[in-house]
């Protein structure tokens, strides 16, 4: 039975330009965290591996860093960053659990945090 | 050209271990991980492990883990798979294979070493 | 451990036939899922790779297709050099594992 559930920063908001720390957090679980894949609508960004460690998409080495932790930074953001994030913590021996994150990419300085969200 | 030799056949008594080797040449060994997969006779195709040349990190398949140990030689460009505790079942053809793409996770193995029979018999 | 399971094991056909192999991951594994062909004697050959992105130097007659847990790899006209055993791989999670292989056989 799957008793974690997976905190996100939830919707955020960044300067274009910026850079912006994407950030997923398991817990109420005792599960073993084998892998972490982040990735934007089904395009790899980086795969965090227990054994084998962080490995980011060439198509996304320039602009994007491993960490803190299991989270991933966005670097020289864009407007076309805009979109969804997903963090899939896989587990053993519950299985998958799935994370959302939506970023948006502003032009203008107003850009703010949003509150704090969770997903079972 | 790039390729992956492995050495010779062996023939092992139960208990004893194997340490089979991968030479690579044609391509920097650094940037690519290196799997072994096994197949027995008339069986098909095991993935036991990976290694990281570049910083020797590693992963192993559950089954093997605690008789298998994947190790390698920046110096001589070889990987190293040596498997510990032999039983009959562990006969086979043993191979090295490259990960397709450099520095990235390891989509498909690409080249692959010519195989090294591996025979368990009392 | 992700499962993979082939089917059918084993099949007959002709040359100049249309072949399809199927394969079915235990957990989704979007499209990481790699082809591969093998011979008696021989070491596996890599023909497709990420689900349907063909390897260099593999006939165009070879594709993949599928996403998730169903993924399908196509002959579209069987040569007779085609005849082996073919493999499908998982390359989402360690372990890495393979399919139980299914052998195409000359009808």
């Known amino acids: 039975m799957m008793t974690g559930t997976i905190e996100t920063t939830g919707n955020i908001s960044a300067e274009k330009g910026g850079s912006i720390i994407l950030q997923c957090h398991l817990s109420s679980t005792t599960a073993q965290v084998t892998q972490v894949n982040w990735e934007q609508q089904d395009q790899l960004l980086a795969i965090c591996n227990a054994d084998l460690g962080w490995h980011i998409s060439p198509s996304f080495k320039d602009r994007v860093a491993p960490g803190p932790g299991l989270g991933l930074t966005l670097q020289s953001l864009t407007v076309n960053d805009t979109g969804e994030y997903f963090c899939i913590y896989h587990t053993y021996p519950d299985g998958t659990y799935t994370g959302r994150i939506f970023l948006e990419v502003l032009e203008s300085s107003v850009a703010e945090h949003g509150a704090r969200f969770q997903i079972p | 050209q790039v390729q992956l030799v492995q050495s010779g056949a062996e023939v092992k008594k139960p208990g004893a271990s194997v340490k089979v080797s991968c030479k690579a040449s044609g391509y920097t060994f650094t940037s690519y991980y290196m799997s072994w997969v096994r197949q027995a006779p008339g069986q098909g195709l095991e993935w036991m492990g990976i290694i990281n040349p570049s910083g020797g990190s590693t992963s192993y398949a559950q089954k093997f883990q605690g008789r298998v140990t994947m190790t390698r030689d920046t110096s001589t460009s070889t990987v190293y798979m040596e498997l510990s505790s032999l039983r009959s079942e562990d006969t086979a053809v043993y191979y090295c294979?490259?990960?397709?793409?450099?520095?990235?996770?390891?989509?498909?193995?690409?080249?692959w070493g010519q195989g090294t029979t591996v025979t368990v018999s009392s | 451990d992700i499962q993979m399971t082939q089917s059918p094991s084993s099949l007959s056909a002709s040359v100049g036939d249309r072949v399809t192999i199927t394969c079915r991951a235990s957990?989704?594994?979007?499209?990481?899922l790699n082809w591969y062909q093998q011979k008696p004697g021989k070491a596996p050959k890599l023909l497709i790779y990420a689900a349907s992105s063909l390897q260099s130097g593999v006939p165009s007659r070879f594709s993949g297709s599928g996403s998730g847990t169903d993924f399908t790899l196509t002959i579209s006209s069987l040569q007779p050099e085609d005849f082996a055993t073919y493999y499908c791989?998982?390359?989402?999670?360690?372990?890495?594992?393979f399919g139980g292989g299914t052998k195409v056989e000359i009808k």
């Open positions: 957990q989704s594994i979007n499209s990481y």
């Open positions: 294979a490259r990960a397709r793409y450099p520095s990235s996770w390891p989509y498909g193995m690409d080249v």
């Open positions: 791989q998982q390359s989402l999670l360690t372990p890495f594992t």
